[in-house]
């Protein structure tokens, strides 16, 4: 891997498991104020595999609000607006990092957590299940 | 909002900007060992709006590797396997949290950063722009 010289201005770490426990500045850089995905694009409605967005809230997590996509139909919407069951609407999932308060209810101590979220849906050709 | 009593076992914070700077345990909980999205599903190939996955690596970021989706076509794949330009392949984007080493090259000091990533693509009905 790439070896990067350590910056002499780095904070010291007294943690024996260094760098397992690190200092994190929560002043978010590159902040995008638009956190409601419904406002950022209307793809969820215009897609051939449309989805609904469900608000998932957890005060013990940062960010506390995550939007989860749920595909509206089993099939995909065709040119006539009907559901075509020769195709499948499927969720596109992504693993994201969140901060989980640990110990619980602590304002300044967290643990990194990976969670799988559904971001939207896409239309795919199905794998046909043949009867045994 | 919900008021949660502070856990008496929380670590103390000497940071004047508390809780702007927090302690984070990097031992990831709920770790999903399958980090290569190509292995987790073949939707990127089976979709009517297929996409390619590009590896974005940055040693100053955690996670250092992020996969970015790029739609293969402007249009969508129809039942005959041809590109239908009456429809559009568009990226589904999501804002995710990453940790950025700050000051640079420091192993145990980070700042939270929000970045916009393309997770996959979906097929949408285009917005037709009429000439005035």
């Amino acid at each position: 891997g790439i070896t990067i010289p350590r910056n002499p201005g780095c904070p010291n770490s007294e943690d024996k498991n260094f760098p397992r426990t690190v200092m994190v500045n929560l002043n978010i850089h590159n902040r995008n104020t638009n956190t409601n995905p419904k406002r950022s694009s209307d793809y969820y409605n215009r897609s051939t595999s449309p989805w609904n967005l469900h608000r998932n809230e957890d005060p013990e997590r940062y960010p506390s609000v995550i939007w989860e996509a749920k595909c509206r139909h089993l099939g995909c919407i065709n040119a006539d607006g009907n559901v075509d069951y020769h195709m499948n609407s499927v969720p596109i999932q992504q693993e994201i990092l969140v901060l989980r308060r640990e110990p619980p209810h602590c304002p300044n101590s967290f643990r990194l957590e990976k969670i799988l979220v559904s971001v939207g849906c896409t239309c795919v050709t199905p794998i046909v299940h043949h009867v045994a | 909002g919900i008021t949660i009593p502070r856990n008496p076992g929380c670590p103390n914070s000497e940071d004047k900007n508390f809780p702007r700077t927090v302690m984070v345990n990097l031992n990831i909980h709920n770790r999903n060992t399958n980090t290569n999205p190509k292995r987790s599903s073949d939707y990127y190939n089976r979709s009517t709006s297929p996409w390619n996955l590009h590896r974005n690596e940055d040693p100053e970021r955690y996670p250092s590797v992020i996969w970015e989706a790029k739609c293969r076509h402007l249009g969508c794949i129809n039942a005959d396997g041809n590109v239908d330009y009456h429809m559009n392949s568009v990226p589904i984007q999501q804002e995710i949290l990453v940790l950025r080493r700050e000051p640079p090259h420091c192993p145990n000091s980070f700042r939270l950063e929000k970045i916009l990533v393309s997770v996959g693509c979906t097929c949408v009905t285009p917005i037709v722009h009429h000439v005035a």
């Epitope: 509206r72 089993l74 607006g81 009907n82 559901v83 069951y85 020769h86 199905p126 299940h129 | -």
Partner: antibody, heavy 117, light 107 residues
């Protein structure tokens, strides 16, 4: 003409399973999805789920997730709905219905399932 | 899930009269609404789909209207065979749901 013929009435004990069949004729079976809807005596209609007769994939009402299975046999143009861990509240008439244009145009005659100890 | 509320619960009318049945959705369902008629001991029968399109063989005294959250089924002149229970159903998003029904009975 299009016809959906369902299997006969069933009496089951609580905790048991029931499998209802729906034989289609008069059209190409794999061209239309099949829905399952139930109706308790004197009550309204309740959507249970839908199966793509083409792929075999299904989507259920969350209320039944883990208890319902929907399958199909394309060679005999038949769809099946199996409900397990039966309870008295599952006593109802179960219908299969073909989907067309975001609606259910043809329905089976219904299968009465009685759950009683 | 999307909740469909039908009103009135019961409509008492005489043959020849006009029947107006309402169906309200808890959220916007565009025009993805169907109407069914059910008689005792029978399976439901499709009348209207896409909120306003009559199904094949349905008499033109049946008409549907509405979009978004408010939908109406109108029977312009009630015939004796029209006395039944009517259900609306949304096909906008799974789980697809039905209204509680409106019973049209002879006055």
């Amino acid at each position: 003409q299009v016809q959906l013929v369902q299997s006969g009435a069933e009496v089951k004990k609580p905790g048991a399973s029931v499998k209802v069949s729906c034989k289609a004729s008069g059209y190409t079976f794999t061209d239309y999805a099949m829905h399952w809807v139930r109706q308790a005596t004197g009550q309204g209609l309740e959507w249970m789920g839908v199966i793509s007769t083409y792929s075999g994939d299904a989507r259920f009402n969350q209320k039944f997730t883990g208890r319902v299975t929907m399958t199909r046999n394309t060679s005999i143009s038949t769809a099946y709905m199996e409900l397990s861990s039966l309870r008295s509240e599952d006593t109802a008439v179960y219908y299969c219905a073909r989907e067309v244009r975001r609606s259910m145009d043809y329905w089976g005659q219904g299968t009465t399932v009685t759950v009683s100890s | 899930e999307i909740v469909l509320t039908q009103s009135p619960g019961t409509l008492s009318l005489s043959p020849g009269e006009r029947a107006t049945l309402s169906c309200k959705a808890s959220q916007d369902v565009s025009t993805a609404v169907a109407w069914y008629q059910q008689k005792p001991g029978q399976a439901p029968r499709l009348l209207i789909y896409w909120a306003s399109t009559r199904h094949t063989g349905i008499p033109d005294r049946f008409s549907g209207s509405g979009s978004g959250t408010d939908f109406t089924l109108t029977i312009s002149r009630l015939e004796p065979e029209d006395f039944a229970v009517y259900y609306c159903q949304q096909h906008y998003s799974t789980p697809y749901t039905f209204g509680g029904g409106t019973k049209v009975e002879i006055k």
